[in-house]
């Protein structure tokens, strides 16, 4: 890391250091020989995270309704407002700029990860021993029925689509 | 009462590396920055860099960049300084020095030492 | 880097007199300067910073001047106990730096 001219929390500004605005407020004016910085609140709506010598605060994100996306953790002067989405919708971005609906497992798969605000379904494609018959984005993949437990014989093999069918044993003298 | 007590004298070859420890009691540690400075025989003040206790945080002067390393155990009030590839003229004493409180400085970095340990005499000679 | 040069190299008084060692820097430090003594085999002590606040414990016969480039440092009536080398440090920006020193030895 190279040498720096000042303190942590100091920029160099006219071949001097100056304190740093902390988090949550903008620069004003820089110090002078006899004068510390000058900083001032970010207003409401802005925020700024880091110490800084930002004239302007950032504005607080916008969490758009018609985007699917509704306000998680609202912001402060400190801190960015944080956008999450509509139950049954998922960001499409680390930042969650905007929202996508969950993805439903087809069938033949079932969910191995139920979605969140900020990750979509994971599917996963049924084994051989399970199957599944419908399009979700919950369900997860089923066992097929054991005819055995249920004195009955498979008639018809399942796949991972479909349940195996079972019929009665043919009782053979 | 403040008091910085640096370890003892080190006799090292050409190209070895020195790690000398200072131990600060009577005030808060992680308050002030921690400087270093050398004093080569017969010669003036050197600056070497500085270490700032809270977050760990290190400043070095251009000429130890890549050869020196300062760090620091809060649990027991330490700060140490690692000298690599050893020459004969880094042959000094090097001490330790407190700056002033953080949070005092506005303008300017105003690193003045009040308090100073004692010295520790680093000797590289074959 | 900002470089201090500091003048004379040493000088030779007797108790009693008045002593004043000037430093330059190569750029502007505002009146980000401190004054040390340092005795032989003792680390140095501070005597005064932001170029004419005296440092506490410090006796009032030493005084600093100065701001920008041109600094001064003035022991008013040498002691005996003042003989010793003195340096200027500026405290502008990193990388401090000192001067060469000035030494104060009995006429």
């Known amino acids: 890391e190279p040498p720096t001219a000042c303190r942590e929390k100091q920029y160099l500004i006219n071949s001097q250091c100056c304190s740093l605005c902390q988090p949550g407020q903008k620069l004003v004016s820089d110090c002078t020989e006899f004068t510390e910085t000058e900083c001032l609140p970010c207003g409401e709506s802005e925020f700024l995270d880091t110490w800084n010598r930002e004239t302007h605060c950032h504005q607080h994100k916008y969490c758009d309704p018609n985007l699917g996306l509704r306000v998680q953790q609202k912001g402060t002067s400190e801190t960015d407002t944080i956008c999450t989405c509509e139950e049954g919708w998922h960001c499409t971005s680390e930042a969650c700029e905007s929202c996508v609906l969950h993805r439903s497992c087809s069938p033949g798969f079932g969910v191995k990860q139920i979605a969140t605000g900020v990750s979509d379904t994971i599917c996963e494609p049924c084994p051989v021993g399970f199957f599944s018959n419908v399009s979700s984005a919950f369900e997860k993949c089923h066992p097929w029925t054991s005819c055995e437990t249920k004195d009955l014989v498979v008639q018809q093999a399942g796949t991972n689509k479909t349940d195996v069918v079972c019929g009665p044993q043919d009782r053979l003298r | 009462q403040v008091q910085l007590v640096q370890s003892g004298a080190e006799v090292k070859k050409p190209g070895a590396s020195v790690k000398v420890s200072c131990k600060a009691s009577?005030?808060?540690?992680?308050?002030?920055?921690m400087h270093w400075v050398r004093q080569a025989p017969g010669q003036g003040l050197e600056w070497m860099g500085w270490i700032n206790p809270d977050s760990g945080g290190t400043n070095y002067a251009q000429k130890f960049q890549g050869r020196v390393t300062m760090t620091r155990d809060t649990s027991i009030s330490t700060a140490y300084m690692e000298l690599n590839r050893l020459r004969s003229d880094d042959t000094a004493v090097y001490y330790c020095?407190?700056?002033?409180?953080?949070?005092?400085?506005?303008?300017?970095?105003?690193?003045?030492?009040?308090?100073w340990g004692q010295g520790t005499l680093v000797t590289v000679s074959s | 880097d900002i470089q201090m040069t500091q003048s004379p190299s040493s000088v030779s008084a007797s108790v009693g007199d008045r002593v004043t060692i000037t430093c330059r820097a190569s750029q502007g430090i505002y009146s980000w300067l401190a004054w040390y003594q340092q005795k032989p085999g003792k680390a140095p002590n501070l005597l005064i910073y932001?170029?004419?606040t005296l440092q506490s414990g410090v006796p009032s016969r030493f005084s600093g001047s100065g701001s920008g480039t041109d600094f001064t440092l003035t022991i008013s009536s040498l002691q005996p106990e003042d003989f010793a080398t003195y340096y200027c440090?500026?405290?502008?920006?990193?990388?401090?730096?000192f001067g060469g020193g000035t030494k104060v030895q009995i006429k």
């Open positions: 009577g005030y808060t540690f992680t308050g002030y920055y």
């Open positions: 932001t170029a004419s």
């Open positions: 440090q500026q405290a502008n920006i990193f990388p401090l730096t």
């Open positions: 020095a407190r700056d002033q409180p953080l949070g005092y400085c506005t303008n300017g970095v105003c690193s003045y030492f009040d308090y």
